[in-house]
Each structure stands twice: as structure tokens, then as C-alpha cells.
């Protein structure tokens, strides 16, 4: 494939990467599900500067983010390192919450109202931001 | 790497007290919900408490409600079992456990006899 | 308190032959479900989280399936090191509760 060089419509870019803000709600798998058919993955926050650019477009509206620990360890759908990156929970969380009577705890994060982070049920069909690197190479076979 | 280390076990008279600590390492441990699970000899798994990360969740088992205390100090990086009124059936090994058990102590042994 | 039952209590098996372990649950826990692995002397392992999910670094011989009030755990091709014994737990209501294990020994 060749490298990516410029967003694909209606994504936007941003410090070498490109990203794409849903309008409607999905549940987190599902929305994981989607970043990846697109060739991208859900967001995936790094740095403070990353986290003000996701929340400004996304407004005070809940959104996932790739980031989960269904599996035990927290984790990023990147692969980026959880316990040396950038973290930005609201106060009091990660709960895991079992409260909620939808069985199970909370496993999925997901950006607030305020933009700070919160466990959620992965079920809940909240908004979602897919993120692609500009300089990884595209799937696509180079035009000949 | 994750690293659980209890200590704090030992023998005790019924009624006693015991305070168990578990010291952890190498993960976020605030980001984590913690656990205490104990197995008495020769039988299987049972759990005893949780506690969220910032402790605004706390659960008991039944048979320990209102003789045990759950707690942790997310600056020390560490989780606490506070054991009042023992009785004889409390003998066990207790064990740490991060969050479903991905992570696990190498066990504390608590023995309450007269 | 949802209640695990977990069959047979003991399986004997020869190694390279495949294991089959079974958990059911009083009422349905969805996908809530994990496995661990206990030797004598040694904390438990999870192996299986989500009722399908392998745990880090976990061998692909482990795999488990299921969902709601019926699970299994099969190991395929035994090797000597997983001769243990095996516990189901759920994780779908308070309190979380474990099933009683099944011991895989040596035949």
C-alpha cells in the first residue's frame, strides 16, 4: 500500500493524524468495529493538546474512545502503553461500577460533558471519534 | 510487570484482630478496582471484599459484613483488610486480586484458632 | 447470589488428549464469566475473561465459549503443566461468586 498522504473526506486533520467525529451512537465494539473498517481505530489520546482538539469538536456529549479493559488491564486499541500515557479521568474514576443492573462492571471509557474520562458500560450507544495516522501506509493498491 | 505482595497473616485467637496489607507495583493502581479472595485449605475460591480505585465503592461478602474493613492508600500504592471478631471458620489464605483477577498475590495465611 | 456448578469435579486425562470442563450458572451472567488455573502451593491464573477472551499470554490450547447460564473450557492437546485445577467465576451480579473447581489430573 502506499502512504497516506492527506485526510479522506469529511475527516479532519490534525498533528499528522486524521479524524472522524460520528453524529450518532454506537455501542463501543461496534464503534471499535467501525474505526477498523475505515482503516483507522477509535481515538486514541496522548497528550493534553490531543485531548483539547478531540473535546472541542466533540462538544459535552459522551464519546468512546479507544481505550477499555474488558479483558483485565486498562488498554489502548493501539497499542500505546495506558500506565506511562496520558490520562485525563474525571474525579473518582475508573469505578467499575456494578450498580448500574445491566450486569458485568464498566469497561469502556469514554470522554464526559466536561471532555475528562469516565468507565462505562461498552453496551451504551454513545457518539465516537475514529483516528488514522497520515503517515502509515494506506491499504489501498497505489494507482498505476 | 504486576506485583502483588500481601502480608500481615498469622495465628489468632478467636475474636481476635488482624490488619492484612497488599503492597503493589508496576500498573496504575488507582486506575484499578481491588479485591481480597480467600481459600481455606484444601477448598476453593471464595470472595471477601472489593474496593474501587478512588474507594467510592465498597462490597462485602455476607460473612464478613460488619467484622471486616476494606480500604487503600492509592499514594502508598497499597490495599488493606482490617479483620475484627475472627472466628474459626475466617482460617484461610487471603488473597490480593487486581480488578477480575488479572493480577494475583502470592497468598497470606491467616489462621484462627484458640 | 447466583451460584456456579462446575463438572465433573475431577477429569482424568491423558496428556496430549484434549479436556473439556464445564460451568453453569443459576441465572444467566451474559459473557460475564472467567477462568483461572490453580496449582498446589500457587495464587490462581486467569486464563479466560469475557467467557471467550484469552488472558495475556495465555496459550491458544485454552479456549473457552459459551454464554448466559452455560460455559466450557476446553484444552486441547494437555501438556504436562496444565494439570491443575480450574475454577469458573462470575462477574455479572454482586457478589461475584466462584464455582467449587475441577481438578484435571493424570490418567
Known amino acids: 500500500g502506499s502512504e497516506r498522504t492527506c485526510c479522506p473526506v469529511n475527516w479532519v486533520e490534525h498533528e499528522r493524524s486524521c479524524y472522524w467525529f460520528s453524529r450518532s451512537g454506537k455501542a463501543w465494539a461496534d464503534a471499535d468495529n467501525y474505526c477498523r473498517l475505515e482503516d483507522a481505530h477509535l481515538v486514541v489520546v496522548t497528550s493534553w493538546e490531543e485531548q483539547k482538539f478531540v473535546q472541542h469538536h466533540i462538544g459535552p456529549v459522551n464519546t468512546w474512545m479507544g481505550l477499555h479493559d474488558q479483558n483485565g488491564p486498562w488498554k489502548w486499541v493501539d497499542g500505546t502503553d495506558y500506565e506511562t500515557g496520558f490520562k485525563n479521568w474525571r474525579p473518582e474514576q475508573p469505578d467499575d461500577w456494578y450498580g448500574h443492573g445491566l450486569g458485568g462492571g464498566e469497561d469502556c471509557a469514554h470522554f464526559t460533558d466536561d471532555g475528562r474520562w469516565n468507565d462505562d458500560v461498552c453496551q451504551r450507544p454513545y457518539r465516537w471519534v475514529c483516528e488514522t495516522e497520515l503517515d502509515k501506509a494506506s491499504q489501498e493498491p497505489p494507482l498505476l | 510487570e504486576v506485583q502483588l505482595v500481601e502480608s500481615g497473616g498469622g495465628l489468632v485467637k478467636p475474636g481476635g484482630s488482624l490488619r492484612l496489607s497488599c503492597a503493589a507495583s508496576g500498573f496504575t493502581f488507582s486506575s484499578y478496582t481491588m479485591n481480597w479472595v480467600r481459600q481455606a485449605p484444601g477448598k476453593g475460591l471464595d470472595w471477601v471484599s472489593s474496593?474501587?480505585?478512588?474507594?467510592?465503592?465498597?462490597y462485602y461478602a455476607d460473612s464478613v459484613k460488619g467484622r471486616f474493613t476494606i480500604s487503600r492508600d492509592n499514594a502508598k500504592n497499597s490495599l488493606y483488610l482490617q479483620m475484627n471478631s475472627l472466628r474459626a471458620e475466617d482460617t484461610a489464605v487471603y488473597y490480593c486480586a487486581r480488578d477480575r483477577g488479572s493480577g494475583w498475590g502470592q497468598g497470606t495465611l491467616v489462621t484462627v484458632s484458640s | 447470589e447466583i451460584v456456579m456448578t462446575q463438572s465433573p469435579a475431577t477429569l482424568s486425562v491423558s496428556p496430549g488428549e484434549s479436556a473439556t470442563l464445564s460451568c453453569r450458572a443459576s441465572?444467566?451472567?451474559?459473557?460475564?464469566l472467567a477462568w483461572f488455573q490453580q496449582k498446589p502451593g500457587q495464587a490462581p491464573r486467569l486464563l479466560i475473561n469475557?467467557?471467550?477472551t484469552r488472558a495475556t499470554g495465555i496459550p491458544a490450547r485454552f479456549s473457552g465459549s459459551g454464554s448466559g447460564t452455560e460455559f466450557t473450557l476446553t484444552i486441547s492437546s494437555l501438556q504436562s503443566e496444565d494439570f491443575a485445577v480450574y475454577f469458573c467465576q462470575q462477574y455479572h451480579d454482586w457478589p461475584p461468586t466462584f464455582g467449587q473447581g475441577t481438578k484435571v489430573e493424570i490418567k
Open positions: 474496593i474501587s480505585g478512588s474507594s467510592s465503592y465498597i
Open positions: 441465572q444467566t451472567v451474559s459473557s460475564n
Open positions: 469475557g467467557a471467550s
